[in-house]
């Protein structure tokens, strides 16, 4: 079994991207919910 690297100087960039995507999708869901609620 190969070991994991102890150092990755760019992994945080992907994590940041995932967090942005998550935030964006939450924002979009909240907006969709607002539109549905407003139309009731």
């Amino acid at each position: 079994d190969n070991p994991s690297l102890s150092i990755d100087l760019t992994f945080h960039l992907l994590r940041t991207l995932l967090e942005l995507a998550r935030t964006q999708s939450q924002r979009e869901r909240a907006e969709q919910n607002r539109i549905i609620f407003d139309s009731v």
């Epitope: 079994d1 190969n2 070991p3 994991s4 690297l5 150092i7 990755d8 100087l9 760019t10 992994f11 945080h12 960039l13 992907l14 940041t16 991207l17 995932l18």
Partner: antibody, heavy 113, light 112 residues
Framework: EVQLQQSGPELVKPGVSMKISCKAS????????MNWVKQSHGKNLEWIGL????????IYNQKFKGKATLTVHKSSSTAYMELLSLTSEDSAVYYC??????WGQGTLVTVSA | DVVMTQTPLSLPVSLGDQASISCRSS???????????LHWYLQKPGQSPELLIY???NRFSGVPDRFSGSGSGTDFTLKISRVEAEDLGVYFC?????????FGAGTKLELK
Amino acid sequence: EVQLQQSGPELVKPGVSMKISCKASGYSFTDSTMNWVKQSHGKNLEWIGLIHPDNGGTIYNQKFKGKATLTVHKSSSTAYMELLSLTSEDSAVYYCANGFAYWGQGTLVTVSA
Amino acid sequence: DVVMTQTPLSLPVSLGDQASISCRSSQSLLHSNGNTYLHWYLQKPGQSPELLIYKVSNRFSGVPDRFSGSGSGTDFTLKISRVEAEDLGVYFCSQSTHVPLTFGAGTKLELK
């Protein structure tokens, strides 16, 4: 020991596309990012982008979008960079760099008619 | 894009001298996670760049303790306490805080 073995030098004609490979060994390939870097004129370094082998997630330098495509083949622990529609401006040495820490030996690409 | 400005571009030294290279970034390299992703590489003639110092001041495995890094925010320094023949080559600073990652133009450490 971490090793990144890149494919050999290429002499290609303008307009064609080509793929460079980077075979990784000595560590768990799917655990860390693979970066690609261009070095032209023996000095100037430019980051092309990165890929995470586990999920295929990529981040590109806007400058290289449409020029480079990054992929991986998990079962052979190999990363690939395809360079599209080559011009003389693409003549350079290209490096893969795992985690931006361990670098391959470089692949010289020469674009000439 | 973050511009990395290295000085000097050429640094003539004698063996045993102390050498110092400066790197300035056009914006802060402090990431929201608390890390500063400023790194130093050495490229010897005909070879690939090799990592010396990562995240400002951490020596990479196998790097001699005559190499040290310091700085914060936008202002960083690499010091070599006693230059040896194997240290000659081109030194690059680089940042991986912001996309796209960027490099300095390089500092050539050469003999006087």
